[in-house]
């Protein structure tokens, strides 16, 4: 807290300029008018203030705007943003994407800080949903942003936003998140034809149910093994050998290298060995000839 002292004669700031870097903390407090600072915030960023001096400037703004800064000030905070606490940011009402971009730029190259997380949360809540332009911006700064959201938060993502998602944005998503995003992607891309559709939907297939995988198997899509290995095990298990063969096309040979890993391992255990042998890959572990296959889930339902 800076003590209240009178401004020395001739030192009253008429504008925010470089001469202020020579002011001591108490002089900044006494000689810089908060209203002047607010109207000339855009100049602060160009002046090499020390962290201590920035603390004083923040204090002046806090006094002027105890209920939270207006967006005209927030947009020009620049490095002063790094001085803000999540509690400060919760008082803000940020509606402009330009303001969001300006503040994210300040934090660029760093991991998402609590301040940035709070800012994004305030912005998205203010907009009501995570629209395409916002998602575009956020994933550009933080590729893992989408996967940091809960399934409940993801449910408010409109399908049009999915167009902004790049494959790498989904790298850290878990199956629960993909369960929510996949139906959105299906809706978003539904006007595309077969081959284009598959290219777009491929990254989201970790959330696809069995029905959709069966339908895809009829489309000559030639899914690569990397994508197949990311599919939900429970969605893969009911697929027949013929369906997996159609789904993978020429990539079916890659099953051999993955036979000990999920979901391939579990899928093999569910297939008849006879059927697996038709692939000619030497896959072992299927149900031997003559064995009866009981559907235990059906048995449970009956008991």
């Amino acid at each position: 807290e800076v003590e209240k002292t009178a401004c020395p004669s001739g030192k009253k700031a008429r504008e925010i300029d470089e001469s202020l870097i020579f002011y001591k903390k108490w002089e900044l407090e006494a000689c810089v008018d908060a209203a002047l600072l607010a109207t000339q915030m855009d100049r602060v960023n160009a002046i090499p203030f020390t962290y201590e001096q920035l603390d004083v400037l923040k204090h002046k703004l806090d006094e002027l705007y105890p209920q939270g800064y207006p967006e005209s000030v927030i947009q020009h905070l620049g490095y002063l943003f790094l001085k803000m606490s999540p509690e400060d940011i919760r008082k803000w009402n940020v509606t402009s994407l330009e303001t969001l971009k300006a503040l994210l730029e300040v934090n660029k190259g760093h991991e998402m800080s609590p301040q940035v997380a709070t800012l994004i949360d305030r912005f998205v809540k203010g907009r009501g949903q995570l629209d395409k332009d916002t998602l575009d911006t956020l994933t550009a700064f933080y590729p893992g942003y989408l996967c940091s959201l809960s399934p409940e938060e993801l449910s408010s993502v409109p399908p049009s936003s999915i167009w902004a998602v790049r494959p790498q944005d989904l790298d850290t998503c878990d199956p629960r998140q993909l369960d929510v995003l996949y139906p959105k992607a299906r809706l978003a891309f539904q006007n595309m034809n077969g081959s284009e559709y598959f290219v777009k939907i491929q990254s989201f297939l970790g959330g696809a149910p069995t029905e959709d995988l069966k339908a895809l198997s009829q489309q000559n899509v030639s899914m690569d093994l990397a994508t197949f290995m990311k599919l939900r095990t429970d969605a893969v298990l009911p697929l027949t050998v013929a369906e997996v063969q159609k789904l993978l096309g020429p990539h079916v040979e890659g099953l051999k290298a993955e036979e000990r890993h999920r979901p391939v391992r579990d899928w093999i255990l569910r297939q008849r060995q006879d059927d697996l042998d038709t692939l000619g890959l030497g896959l072992q572990g299927g149900i031997p000839n003559g064995y009866l296959v009981l559907d235990l889930s059906m048995q449970e339902a009956l008991s």
Epitope: P151, P158, P159, V180, L187, Q190, N191, G194, Y197, Q218
Partner: antibody, heavy 122, light 106 residues
């Protein structure tokens, strides 16, 4: 033959909420998307939203955002549509419809419920 | 918001061909579906993805879509085809239904 059976007609006061249910006969209901469409008296069809097979993902028409909630009880093969802050303009027949076709990017509404008339009147 | 416009009514004699149009900006870039609705009944899907027929729908129903217009054609129209018909397409974040066309079989 698969059927979607909806709950009965409702009369509600403005500002209230209504919850319409849609139950499927048959064991495969939980494998399909369910959509909701409404039709005001003498008017055309209006899409409200969609819920995925597991019930974890919903997409609502912008017009109903914040007022509509679609949920799914997979144990009873029932989907629910709740509309809040009702006004007289919400008086309509509300339909649930299921996407059963197997097209890989297909969302046609193949099987429809019989409709539920919701009347909003003071 | 996206709009799909249909003629309010179309009249056709039994055995003749009825064509119902549905106009929307760049509609040809989207897949169009068509629903039939008879008085007091729930709608029935008759065409999806521009020109595909669900099982159980008679061959006399066909569809096309290009430019700004999708068309539902009923060849050899029968009295039982008298109904309201709605086109539908996905735009941005919602399904949009057309204004509806009442087909009367004279």
């Amino acid at each position: 033959e698969v059927q979607l059976v909806q709950s009965g007609a409702e009369v509600k006061k403005p500002g209230a909420s209504v919850k319409v249910s849609c139950k499927a006969s048959g064991d495969t209901f939980n494998r399909y998307y369910v959509q909701w469409v409404r039709q005001a008296p003498g008017q055309g069809l209006e899409w409200m939203g969609i819920i995925n097979p597991s019930g974890v993902s919903t997409t609502y028409a912008q017009k109903f955002q914040g007022r509509v909630t679609m949920t799914r009880d997979t144990s009873t093969s029932t989907v629910y549509m709740e509309l809040s802050s009702l006004r007289s303009e919400d008086t309509a027949v509300y339909y649930c419809a299921e996407t059963r076709g197997s097209g890989f990017n297909y969302f046609g509404m193949d099987v429809w419920g019989q409709g539920t008339l919701v009347t909003v009147s003071s | 918001s996206y709009e799909l416009t249909q003629p309010p009514s179309v009249s056709v004699s039994p055995g003749q061909t009825a064509s119902i149009t549905c106009s929307g900006d760049k509609l040809g870039d989207k897949y169009a579906s068509w629903y039939q609705q008879k008085p007091g009944q729930s709608p029935v899907l008759v065409i999806y993805q521009d020109n595909r027929r669900p099982s159980g729908i008679p061959e006399r129903f066909s569809g096309s879509n290009s430019g700004n217009t999708a068309t539902l054609t009923i060849s050899g129209t029968q009295a039982m085809d008298e109904a309201d018909y709605y086109c539908q397409a996905w735009d941005s974040d919602t399904y949009v239904f057309g204004t509806g066309t009442k087909v009367t079989v004279l």
